[in-house]
């Protein structure tokens, strides 16, 4: 199994190997076989990373950021591979190595351009502040500086602000809209160029429902088509807004297809989950149920926020008895 | 073809400094290591030095650590052999050769037709 | 260092005839050897490298065997043109040191 790495070849003995911050890569360097086989990488020329002659590694003058992270493919290697296998690579790995391999009948130098991506899962959160709401799409760790686009309705947005935090790595990125009294829907996304990874988060306001005391509410929450993908792992909360800030209610992992419930009130239903409807049911209602209930579906790729405002009122005959 | 062409040699008194130099031609010179080589007349052979294609390793055998040094210009296609100190014993025929590639391997195969050095007061 | 140490010094032996030089390591080397042939006032040739791979342009009556300490130069036939003195070397570790080298004669 070969890490996530990808090749992407150009003119000049020259590739591109495109790496994921902390994974493992295999730089690539090919030759025709022969025997006295000598292979040295070098980083831009400078450093050495890993030397091999004389059927065995010499590492005594590697540069000391290489130490335990590189070796070679080393039964391949009479087959014409020198190839690098490179771990847990970082920013600093970005750039060029040069592979030498000299045998008995030729030399040939391979160059390869490493880049590397960052991109932790970003995500879409619904706040309020003060009486403002906002949504906030944020990715704690990205790089090279991402793409975010806004649509309300499915039309971009061209007011885009961005709080951008760099750190030696990477950017940390804020996107906040004010969607204070908007019924709209949103839509935000995220794109790393360099990793050709996208993630979309949306957020769906359903009409306010008005319920009476004592009665229970269904509360609907089914994945949009154009992102959901069942073979994906994904994890559906439910939550409810309280003076500000957001309790859960429930949530259900799809990986292990486990539902945890916190409120006993709560009900889902098993059959509506296997055919992907995470709606929701909540019963013998109260005043202090009042409030926003927000329905979180989150995979790698994608988060949807749908959003609904309950209403209950107290029952004829509670206030008749006020 | 191949070809390396050693100059610089003549005779000098001990404690002085002489520099060899290696001309190289038909191969690429800069993926190649080059080492120096030297023969004291009617005697064996001796390796004194080895410079990496790169530059970025040198070595030396223990009778010149430190009064030697090694050098190499890729973009002039050249190699130099700085001699400081010399003994009588340095007197040799010096002979620049060509290492089977990065200079990693540490065997002969192409070699210079020698430069004659005589260290004598 | 690594001391080479060549059997015989000198040889004579006649055209046509099967010749072997012997070279013994101090400590093993592995298969990392070299065979040399340095004709009068000529510089030194590569003949044999990994012990017994045969240099390119070499003919084929030279070939070379052993590993670890002890290794021979074979000449299956004896020409004229391989009067010559034989050096081996190693190179399995700096400092790179020969033998001391075996001056054949043509009797």
């Known amino acids: 199994i070969f890490p996530l790495a990808f090749f992407i070849y150009v003119p000049m003995n020259e590739q591109i190997v495109i790496g994921r911050l902390d994974e493992d890569i295999i730089l690539p360097s090919s030759f025709e076989r022969g025997s006295e086989v000598v292979i040295h990488w070098k980083y831009q020329d400078s450093y050495k990373v890993h030397s091999y002659y004389k059927g065995s590694d010499h590492l005594e003058s590697q540069d000391p950021r290489y130490a335990n992270r590189t070796s070679l493919f080393y039964n391949e290697i009479q087959n014409g591979n020198a190839s690098l296998f490179f771990r847990r690579v970082s920013l600093l790995d970005e750039g060029i190595y040069t592979c030498y391999v000299g045998t008995a009948i030729q030399v040939i130098t391979n160059k390869v351009v490493l880049k590397v991506g960052v991109f932790l899962t970003p995500v879409m959160k619904y706040e309020k502040r003060n009486t403002n709401s906002f949504l906030i799409c944020s990715v704690l760790s990205v790089y090279p500086r991402p793409i975010i686009t806004w649509k309300m309705d499915n039309t971009p947005i061209s007011e885009n602000n961005m709080e951008e935090t760099g750190s030696l790595d990477s950017f940390s990125i804020n996107s906040p809209l004010n969607i204070t009294g908007s019924n709209s829907s949103y839509e935000c996304t995220i794109e790393n160029s360099l990793l050709k990874q996208t993630w979309t988060g949306r957020w769906t306001m359903k009409d306010g429902l008005h319920k009476m005391q004592s009665e229970h509410v269904s509360l609907s929450c089914q994945p949009v088509n154009d992102y959901f993908s069942p073979n994906q792992d994904f994890k559906v909360t439910w939550s409810r807004m309280k003076s500000g800030t957001f309790s859960v209610l429930a949530y259900y992992l799809s990986s292990s297809q486990n539902t945890i419930i916190n409120e006993s009130r709560f009900s889902w239903n098993k059959e509506l989950i296997n055919q992907s409807d995470f709606s929701m049911n909540l019963m013998d209602l109260n005043l202090s149920d009042s409030g926003e209930y927000l329905c979180n579906i989150s995979s790698d790729e994608y988060t949807l926020l749908t959003i609904h405002t309950v209403h209950v009122e107290p029952s004829q005959e509670t206030a008749s008895h006020n | 073809q191949v070809q390396l062409v050693e100059s610089g040699g003549g005779v000098v008194q001990p404690g002085r400094s002489l520099r060899l130099s290696c001309a190289a031609s038909?191969?690429?010179?800069?993926?190649?290591?080059i080492h120096w080589v030297r023969q004291a007349p009617g005697k064996g052979l001796e390796w004194v030095a080895v410079?990496?294609?790169?530059?970025?390793?040198?070595y030396y055998a223990d009778s010149v650590r430190g009064r030697f040094t090694i050098s190499r210009d890729n973009s002039k296609n050249t190699l130099s052999l700085q001699m400081n100190s010399l003994r009588v014993e340095d007197t040799a025929v010096y002979y620049c050769?060509?290492?089977?590639?990065?200079?990693?391997?540490?065997?002969?195969?192409?070699w210079g037709q020698g430069t004659l050095v005589t260290v004598s007061s | 260092d690594i001391q080479m140490t060549q059997s015989p010094s000198t040889l004579s032996a006649s055209v046509g005839d099967r010749v072997t030089i012997t070279c013994r390591a101090s400590?093993?080397?592995?298969?990392?050897l070299a065979w040399y042939q340095q004709k009068p006032g000529k510089a030194p040739k590569l003949l044999i490298y990994?012990?017994?791979s045969l240099e390119s342009g070499v003919p084929s009556r030279f070939s070379g065997s052993g590993s670890g300490t002890e290794f021979t130069l074979t000449i299956s036939s004896l020409q004229p043109d391989d009067l010559a003195t034989y050096y081996c070397?190693?190179?399995?570790?700096?400092?790179?040191?020969f033998g001391q080298g075996t001056k054949l004669e043509i009797k």
């Open positions: 050769a060509r290492d089977r590639s990065s200079g990693a391997m540490g065997y002969f195969v192409y």
């Open positions: 038909g191969f690429t010179f800069s993926d190649y290591g």
């Open positions: 990994k012990a017994s």
């Open positions: 410079i990496w294609y790169d530059a970025s390793d040198k």
């Open positions: 070397q190693q190179y399995q570790s700096y400092s790179y040191t």
């Open positions: 400590q093993s080397i592995s298969s990392w």
